[in-house]
């Protein structure tokens, strides 16, 4: 009852002729345990006895031994894992045919076929390919043989056209109750060079002697692979020769359907066939040039030919870094040529005439100077000739005024408070002139660019400046006017003494100025309009108070005269002509009132008195005037008065009072 | 006719400051393409250019020296001046003054015309 | 810094060609170098003989020309004379310096 058996094994077994089988065996019964196992060699059912007939391989019994059983046949299962593994080593081709499990357990019987392939020689393994192959795309290649065995060693190895292929392959068996095989892959990118070539998976034994092999030929797709020609076979020519470019497929697959021609990256118009001709070439068609055929793969492009049209220099241009430039500044100047090939020489010419000595692209002035303004042309040299040297360039060289003078256009001399007019000269600038810029700065006019009118000129004003401006400022030298003026700040300065004058003293008196042009003068001393001297000094040997007075000293050049203010000449002195005066006479009646008044001449004025009699007798009174009220007759007598001033003292000549008697008294009497 | 007369101290001492005049007659450093330039020469050996100033007041200097120079000029003195900061026994030479111009008619400097030079010693 | 290298003697004859050369550490002397070339005679009286490569200054004998020899400045004295018996300085100029050669000593065999 095949329901109560499950038997599992790979069904067929392949191997050949010296070569061994192994195979994998598993079972299962429902009701008890394997009892006797018998392998046949093509049984038959005898129906008459009820029994298989056959060749019996192996044979196990209940006790397990193996009575009459070939040695290259063993059984490597066991009844305990349900194991029904077997090999035969070596296996004949005569071993063809079925091998019959005939499994008998307590309550049942089953006979299991498998199916033994044993070929004379060693049979092929098989090379599996993915159904596409294209340039570039990694696939796996397998090679798959239906053997493996313990007993017999076997390799798989890959070649290409014959050669041993580098990359590693992973070889695997099986060796399971599903399958029976020897499989080898290999990792491979197929280039559009191995479209066509045969790759075959050898079976080596043991030895590495080849056993069998299989072949496939790729069929690898790809883009178009090309190369272009060029006839000539120079790509160097020259402006009107001919040239023709021919694009060789040398390989697609499939086979290729548009071709199209490209310069520099942008098709051409109407170049569609593999041949592509340029009559009398121009310079612009120097240019790097490839072809471009597609197939259903995608588009391919040659490696591109850079096609050089030679020609004599064209006329050329002068580049300048900058202009207008700076005095002092960095020019360059580039000669721009177009030639091909590049001109190897160049002449630089600056207002026609060749600059010496410069024959490069570049020609550098390391510091402009005005005389390098001009036009600068050039003319490039290459193995074609000369080119037509271009109308050139002109270079402006700016640079601050030069030269800058100042002219006083007056006639000299200059005196103070004329007008005076003075012009601003320069010899050459670039830019010109458009401003004019005077030192010191005053409110001065400026009728016309560059000339300054000063009106009224001080007597100060010594130097004047001027400067020309355009982008810049260049100033002159000062010029001195040398304004003439009458002397200024005249004054009287006391030389000596250096304290207060004192009557006796020595004194001089100095007729100072502050500046004079011209510088020679004269001097003069007044004194309430009388003149006293004409020295800068004037001297006393002994002042006395009548010396006091106001004193002015005048300078004089040939410009003028100057007066200096007036100056108070104070003279001290102690008190000088002291008298005593009486203002009602020197008689006076008794009981009247005496005054009598202390007159003197003094500087300071006198701030102390004093009063005496006949005997030198001090009075008690210290005022200028002594007041006798009311007189008697014995005040009469005479009188002297003293007085005092920091300077000094003085005192007055006697003086007599005489009191007489008052009609009453003598009435009295 | 163009001359330069270098003139300075002689003799000084390390970390000393060195000055050195150049008086120059027949141009003038207001006049466009002349400059001044200063080389030394050490005993028995080459030329070293220290630096130059041109009328436009660009001034260049040795890269090695620059921190330690100065140049100057007075244009209406006719002077040109240099000063070598914390001077050192290395500069020990002979210090000359040369005009560089720029010719007219011409595109590039010239060192045209030399002093005679002034010799200098660092001594401690 | 570059280093300026000149031959350090030269012996010619009245009446021969002589070349200098002048040879920059930082590669081919070009015309932005302005090569300059000085003479220096007995006493230290130095003398400018040419600038910007090719120039000769105001005043020099047609006799000493100045040019560019590969890749290096070159002073030639054609037809030498013996007064011309001198140290020859070569200096170049890198974009803010001059650098001087060590110097060539050129006797004239009388």
């Known amino acids: 009852d095949s329901s109560k058996w499950n038997i599992e094994h790979p069904g067929t077994i392949y191997a050949w002729e010296g070569a061994c089988v192994w195979v994998p065996c598993t079972y299962r019964v429902l009701d008890g345990a394997l009892e006797t196992f018998i392998l046949f060699h093509n049984p038959e059912y005898n129906q008459n006895m009820s029994k298989f007939e056959g060749t019996r391989l192996y044979e196990s019994t209940k006790d397990g031994k193996v009575p009459s059983g070939q040695k290259r046949v063993q059984f490597l299962g066991n009844k305990i894992n349900n194991n029904c593994t077997l090999s035969i080593h070596p296996v004949h081709v005569n071993d063809s045919g079925q091998l019959g499990l005939r499994m008998v357990s307590k309550t049942e019987k089953w006979m299991e076929r498998i199916h033994l392939n044993v070929s004379e020689r060693p049979f092929p393994p098989r090379i599996q390919l993915p159904p596409k192959l294209q340039e570039s795309q990694e696939v796996t290649l397998t090679c798959l043989l239906n053997f493996s065995c313990y007993g017999y060693q076997i390799q798989l190895q890959w070649l290409l056209e014959g050669v041993p292929m580098r990359q590693a392959a992973v070889t695997s068996t099986s060796l399971s109750t599903k399958s029976v095989f020897t499989r080898s892959e290999l990792k491979f990118s197929p280039q559009w060079s191995h479209h066509g070539k045969i790759v075959t998976c050898e079976l080596h034994d043991v030895d590495g002697k080849v056993l069998s092999e299989d072949m496939v030929q790729l069929n690898v797709k790809h883009t178009p692979k090309l190369t272009i020609e060029v006839t000539p076979n120079e790509t160097i020519v020259r402006k009107g020769d001919s040239v023709t470019m021919t694009c060789k497929v040398n390989s697609s697959n499939p086979e290729y359907t548009t071709v199209s021609w490209l310069k520099d990256g942008i098709p051409l118009k109407e170049q569609n066939t593999l041949m592509l001709t340029l009559h009398e070439v121009t310079k612009s068609q120097t240019g790097r040039y490839c072809c471009r055929v597609s197939n259903d793969v995608g588009p391919a492009t040659s490696e591109k030919v850079f096609l050089q049209v030679q020609y004599a220099p064209e006329p050329s241009r002068v580049q300048i870094s900058q202009s207008p430039a700076v005095e002092g500044s960095e020019v360059n100047f580039l000669c721009i040529s177009p030639a091909n090939p590049l001109p190897t020489n160049y002449t630089w010419y600056h207002n026609g005439k060749e600059v010496q000595g410069r024959t490069e692209k570049q020609f550098q002035i390391q510091k402009i100077l005005p005389w390098h303004a001009g036009t600068y042309s050039c003319e490039a040299e290459n193995i074609l000739g000369i080119g037509e040297r271009g109308p050139g360039t002109e270079l402006d060289v700016q640079y601050p005024p030069k030269k800058v003078t100042m002219v006083i256009e007056n006639p000299t001399p200059i005196r103070e408070g004329d007008t005076v007019t003075l012009s601003c000269n320069y010899s050459s600038s670039n830019p010109i002139v458009n401003h004019y810029e005077w030192r010191p700065r005053g409110a001065w006019e400026e009728p016309s660019l560059g000339v300054l009118k000063i009106q009224n000129i001080g007597w100060n004003n010594t130097a004047v400046a001027c400067a020309a401006c355009n982008n810049w400022c260049s100033w002159a030298s000062p010029v001195t006017l040398n304004v003439l003026y009458a002397p200024r700040g005249v004054r009287v300065r006391k030389i000596k003494p250096l304290s207060e004058i004192h009557s006796g003293n020595s004194v001089s008196l100095q007729c100072d100025f502050s500046s004079s042009h011209p510088k020679e003068v004269q001097f003069f001393w007044e004194k309430n309009g009388s003149l006293l001297g004409k020295e800068s000094q004037l001297n006393f040997d002994s002042i006395s108070p009548e010396d006091a007075g106001s004193y002015s000293c005048w300078v004089n050049n040939s410009i003028g005269q100057t007066a200096s203010k007036a100056w108070t000449l104070e003279v001290l002195y102690a008190p000088r002509r002291l008298r005593v005066s009486m203002s009602q006479g020197n008689q006076v009646m008794e009981g009247k009132t005496a005054t009598l008044t202390c007159e003197s001449d003094a500087n300071p004025p006198v701030y102390s008195y004093a009063w005496f009699d006949w005997n030198n007798q001090s009075l008690p009174y210290s005022g200028r005037m002594l007041r006798l009220e009311p007189v008697k007759v014995q005040h009469s007598g005479a009188y002297w008065c003293q007085g005092t001033n920091r300077v000094g003292k003085g005192h007055s000549p006697l003086i007599t009072l005489t009191v007489y008697y008052s009609p009453q008294t003598i009435g009295r009497r | 006719q163009v001359t330069l007369k270098e003139s300075g101290p002689g003799i000084l001492q390390p970390s000393q400051t060195l000055s050195l005049t150049c008086s120059f007659s027949g141009f003038s450093l207001s006049t466009s393409g002349m400059g001044v330039g200063w080389i030394r020469q050490p005993s028995g050996k080459g030329l070293e250019w220290l630096a130059h100033i041109w009328w436009d007041d660009d001034e260049y200097y040795n890269p090695a020296l620059k921190s330690r120079l100065t140049i100057s000029k007075d244009t209406s003195k006719n002077q040109v001046f240099l000063k070598i900061a914390n001077v050192d026994t290395a500069d020990t030479a002979t210090y000359y003054c040369?005009?560089?111009?720029?010719?007219?008619?011409?595109?590039?400097?010239?060192?045209?015309?030399w002093g005679t030079g002034t010799t200098v010693t660092v001594s401690a | 810094q570059a280093v300026v290298t000149q031959e350090s003697a030269l012996t010619t004859s009245p009446g021969e060609t002589v070349t200098l050369t002048c040879r920059s550490s930082?590669?081919?002397?070009?015309?932005?170098?302005?090569a300059n070339w000085v003479q220096e005679k007995p006493d230290h009286l130095f003398t400018g003989l040419i600038g910007g490569t090719n120039n000769r200054a105001p005043g020099v004998p047609a006799r000493f020309s100045g040019s560019l020899i590969g890749d290096k400045a070159a002073l030639t004295i054609t037809g030498a004379q013996t007064e011309d018996e001198a140290i020859y300085f070569c200096?170049?100029?890198?974009?803010?310096?001059?650098?001087f050669g060590s110097g060539t000593k050129v006797t004239v065999l009388g």
């Open positions: 930082t590669g081919a002397v070009t015309t932005r170098n302005y």
């Open positions: 040369a005009r560089i111009s720029i010719p007219y008619g011409y595109y590039d400097w010239f060192f045209d015309v």
């Open positions: 200096a170049l100029w890198y974009s803010n310096h001059f650098i």
